[in-house]
């Protein structure tokens, strides 16, 4: 080994990665939540919509408080891969109706990715465990109807903008702690 | 700039024991996870444990797990390699890194012969 | 046997582009696990060269980038220099090892 030197700074560390995942969080939600309300003006929703391969709401408020940085982190990087993959989904699998979305659809796609990479990047900063992100639970086949996969495009954007809303607290709460 | 500048090589029999450590500065320790990697003379880099930024989660490589213990102390800006029962396999320069791992110290040479 | 597999070898004349592959499976590049790059020159200790695929650390030259599809990455270096011959080393976390594993390291020549 040659003499001790210094290495210079990376771009980022570990902080500045969790404030690049906040803003990135942000970011998506606002996107995410401008596309909701495209998607009920142009087709409005009778009622609420669900996918069983959709994951669960992984935090409420009440439980905001006892948070642990590997535990958000996992579920989110595993969360947001699935929401990822259905968005990926819809936009192979949507039908003429859902077409004039696609730019939008597409951004979506693009700023999920940037933020996965960021929440990974994170991860392997802090050496926390990273789990392989599932598949879905329930294979995406296409939709049987042009109705089906605008019911199932509310069900994405409502389920994706709960998640993003915690994960903004969530990622808050955790610069407290970092 | 980022220093991590590790110590505690040299030649050890084998079965016999070694304590590597590895001081840090210029970086906010207490925000990496910390590794330790190996190079054995001539071949390629060999991962070998890992420690979180606060040292809850711990992983080591199969050919280490039961006889390295990594450990760091965040008060000293410390990282360590307790090394035991030690093989003529485990011959390699130590290195220390951190984060990805982003930054890597110089390394520590460990010889196991008889 | 390394994890990743990259070609022992590679070479090329200054000014050339080469390229520098890295395989993996399932369980890491496979599965979302970003991929990143090191350089070690002769004697001295590795260097982070890409990291998450394709971003590069600060001072380091737009001439390397990086590329990660399915289950393979590469590396690719343009306008190749002398002072680029060195070993360059592969990396991406593993599920089933639950750590990093790196690639056997490719060597690289420039003619």
């Known amino acids: 080994p040659g003499p001790p030197a210094g290495s210079p700074r990376v771009s980022s560390d570990p902080r500045a990665d969790l404030d690049s995942a906040v803003l990135l969080t942000r970011s998506l939600l606002a996107d995410t939540r401008q596309l909701a309300a495209q998607m009920r003006d142009k087709f409005p929703a009778d009622g609420d919509h669900n996918l069983d391969s959709l994951p669960t709401l992984a935090m409420s408020a009440g439980t905001l408080g006892s948070l642990q940085l590997p535990g958000v982190l996992t579920r989110l990087r595993v969360d947001l891969m699935s929401y990822f993959r259905h968005v990926q989904w819809l936009r192979r699998a949507a039908g003429p109706s859902l077409k004039t979305l696609e730019p939008e659809l597409g951004a979506l796609q693009a700023r999920l990715e940037r933020l996965l990479r960021r929440l990974q990047l994170l991860m392997s900063r802090l050496a926390l465990p990273q789990a392989a992100p599932d598949q879905p639970a329930v294979p995406l086949g296409p939709p049987a109807s042009a109705w089906g996969s605008i019911r199932a495009a509310h069900a994405i954007l409502g389920g994706l903008h709960l998640t993003l809303d915690w994960a903004v607290r969530g990622l808050l709460l955790l610069k407290t702690r970092l | 700039e980022v220093q991590l500048l590790e110590s505690g090589g040299g030649l050890v029999q084998p079965g016999g024991s070694l304590r590597l450590s590895c001081a840090a500065s210029?970086?906010?320790?207490?925000?990496?996870?910390m590794h330790w990697v190996r190079q054995a003379p001539g071949k390629g880099l060999e991962w070998v444990a890992v420690?979180?930024?606060?040292?809850?989660?711990?992983y080591y490589a199969d050919s280490v797990k039961g006889r390295f213990t990594i450990s760091r102390d965040n008060s000293k800006n410390t990282l360590y390699l307790q090394m035991n029962s030690l093989r003529a396999e485990d011959t390699a320069v130590y290195y220390c890194?951190?984060?990805?791992?982003?930054?890597w110290g110089q390394g520590t040479l460990v010889t196991v012969s008889s | 046997q390394s994890v990743l597999t990259q070609p022992p070898s590679a070479s090329g004349t200054p000014g050339q582009r080469v390229t520098i592959s890295c395989s993996g499976s399932?369980?890491?590049?496979?599965?979302?696990?970003?991929v990143h790059w090191y350089q070690q020159l002769p004697g001295t200790a590795p260097k982070l060269l890409i990291y998450?695929?394709?971003e590069r650390p600060s001072g380091v030259p737009d001439r390397f980038s990086g590329s990660k599809s399915g289950t393979s990455a590469s590396l690719a270096i343009s306008g190749l220099r002398s002072e680029d011959e060195a070993d360059y080393y592969c990396?991406?976390?593993?599920?089933?090892?639950?750590?990093?594993?790196f690639g056997g390291g490719t060597k690289l020549t420039v003619l």
């Open positions: 890194a951190a984060g990805v791992p982003d930054y």
């Open positions: 210029g970086f906010t320790f207490s925000s990496y996870g």
């Open positions: 420690i979180s930024y606060d040292g809850s989660y711990k």
């Open positions: 399932s369980s890491n590049i496979g599965s979302d696990y970003d």
């Open positions: 998450s695929n394709n």
């Open positions: 990396a991406a976390w593993d599920s089933s090892l639950s750590g990093p594993v």
